[in-house]
């Protein structure tokens, strides 16, 4: 998270750290007792590693009573996700057991109405991704409020040049932005999950390259079918 600040500890009980061999890889969001939603590209290079999900965490390193690491029973990338595109960049991870819910671990309601968020709406993004261009990784969860950017502006030739489909949305990236390591994390607008941080290798914090987020409402049928 660039241009953000430390989050209030455990105020985002839906927040997950997707880990590879014990190290933070991507963000994720608890959407059901046994399911975490993240980005498909996160697992592209994880073929031989052990994937786990950390819930109830604020600090990645410090002991916290609510923290628990879950093994992954099943990883379900969206069937249309491909390594070379940002489209359909969603991944559902089934935990080895139902998460123990409490004040610091709770699923987040996700948007089912397939309607664009109004431009200018301030949405909350959180993650353990890098906090500066030198690549410093934070130990504690960071967050930032970002305004939603209209699709027409985001699709300008100087910006993302038509790559933003109706299944994607954009947020401003003028010094405040999501960045490497935040992929798979939640974009929360008005207390509801609206988007998931895509995991391309986009430059961060440059206003001409807005943040790209997968609109969960556009994938409601797929999410429901996997969770069923």
């Amino acid at each position: 998270i660039l241009g953000g600040r430390e989050a209030e500890a455990h105020a985002r009980p839906y927040m997950a750290s997707v880990q590879l061999n014990g190290a933070h890889l991507c963000g994720g969001v608890l959407v059901a007792e046994q399911w975490v939603l993240s980005a498909a590209h996160c697992l592209e290079d994880a073929a031989d590693g052990k994937v786990q999900v950390l819930l109830g965490a604020h600090s990645l390193s410090q002991p916290e009573p609510s923290k628990r690491l879950y093994d992954v029973l099943r990883a379900v990338p969206h069937p249309d996700s491909q390594p070379d595109t940002i489209d359909h960049d969603l991944l559902l991870l089934q935990l080895s057991e139902k998460a123990t819910l409490g004040p610091a671990v709770r699923p987040l309601p996700w948007q089912r109405v397939d309607r664009d968020v109004a431009p200018g709406t301030l949405c909350d993004v959180a993650g353990w991704g890098i906090v500066n261009h030198a690549g410093r990784r934070p130990d504690s969860l960071q967050h930032v409020l970002l305004p939603v950017l209209d699709r027409a502006t985001c699709n300008r030739r100087t910006h993302h040049d038509g790559a933003i489909t109706e299944r994607l949305m954009c947020a401003e990236s003028n010094r405040r932005d999501s960045c490497k390591g935040d992929s798979g994390g939640p974009l929360v607008c008005g207390g509801v999950l609206e988007g998931v941080v895509t995991s391309g290798s986009r430059v961060c914090g440059n206003r001409k390259k807005p943040g790209i987020y997968t609109r969960v409402a556009s994938y409601a049928a797929w999410i429901d079918s996997v969770l069923a």
Partner: antibody, heavy 121, light 106 residues
């Protein structure tokens, strides 16, 4: 203590412009969005827009586009709102407001002292 | 934009009574905020995210609701509760306020 101190009352003529200020103290000014709210007669509250003091990004309620312009001066931790082409409809109390917490449920948790603007010939 | 309608516009009740005011949204919102304002003062945050009391708010206040219908309840009214209460949605830009409920003490 977090405070938003606004400039004093303004009496302005129709067609003129006015610029009101909001000086923040007790927190890091550039960390948080600054919003502006109009309270007109009948006590109706209308959100005007916000500005991010960190990067200047702003958003306006369509109703106030062309009427209000938001700006900031980082060096003095002050936010400004200019209102132009004033009419009697613009007579109101104007508040700056911010959220300086870090939970995902942001709201207007600190309000300015308010600036009364009266438009009269 | 989302329009918020508050009712009643004026509520008159006696100390010790339980009172409830409502806020209806023209389309569904996930949470609602409430503010208290007394004459000559700026609004104060009162309840955020539907049911969480802002700092310093007495526990006789509570908030509830979902979708398009939200309410603020005072379990035992006190004289100091006389004020106007506004609901506000933050789901979508432009952020909108209700017209307010003026609470008077008999």
């Amino acid at each position: 203590e977090v405070q938003l101190q606004q400039s004093g009352p303004e009496l302005v003529k129709p067609g003129a412009s006015v610029k009101i200020s909001c000086k923040a103290s007790g927190y890091s000014f550039t960390d948080y969005y600054m919003h502006w709210v109009k309270q007109s007669h009948g006590n109706i509250l209308d959100w005007i827009g916000y500005i991010d003091p960190y990067n200047g990004v702003s958003s306006y309620n369509q109703k106030f586009k062309g009427k209000a312009t938001l700006s900031v001066d980082q060096s003095s931790s002050t936010a400004y709102m200019e209102l132009r082409s004033l009419t009697s409809e613009d007579s109101a109390v104007y508040y700056c407001s911010s959220y300086y917490g870090s939970s995902p449920y942001w709201y207007f948790d600190v309000w300015g002292t308010g600036t009364r603007v009266t438009v009269s010939s | 934009q989302i329009v918020l309608s508050q009712s009643p516009a004026i509520l008159s009740a006696s100390p010790g009574e339980k009172v409830t005011m409502t806020c209806r949204a023209s389309s569904s919102v996930s949470y609602m905020h409430w503010y208290q304002q007394k004459p000559g003062s700026s609004p104060k945050p009162w309840i955020y995210a539907t049911s969480n009391l802002a700092s310093g708010v007495p526990t006789r206040f509570s908030g509830s609701g979902s979708g398009t219908s939200y309410s603020l309840t005072i379990s035992k009214l006190e004289a100091e509760d006389a004020a106007t209460y506004y609901c506000q949605q933050w789901s979508s830009n432009p952020y909108t306020f209700g017209g307010g409920t003026k609470l008077e003490i008999k």
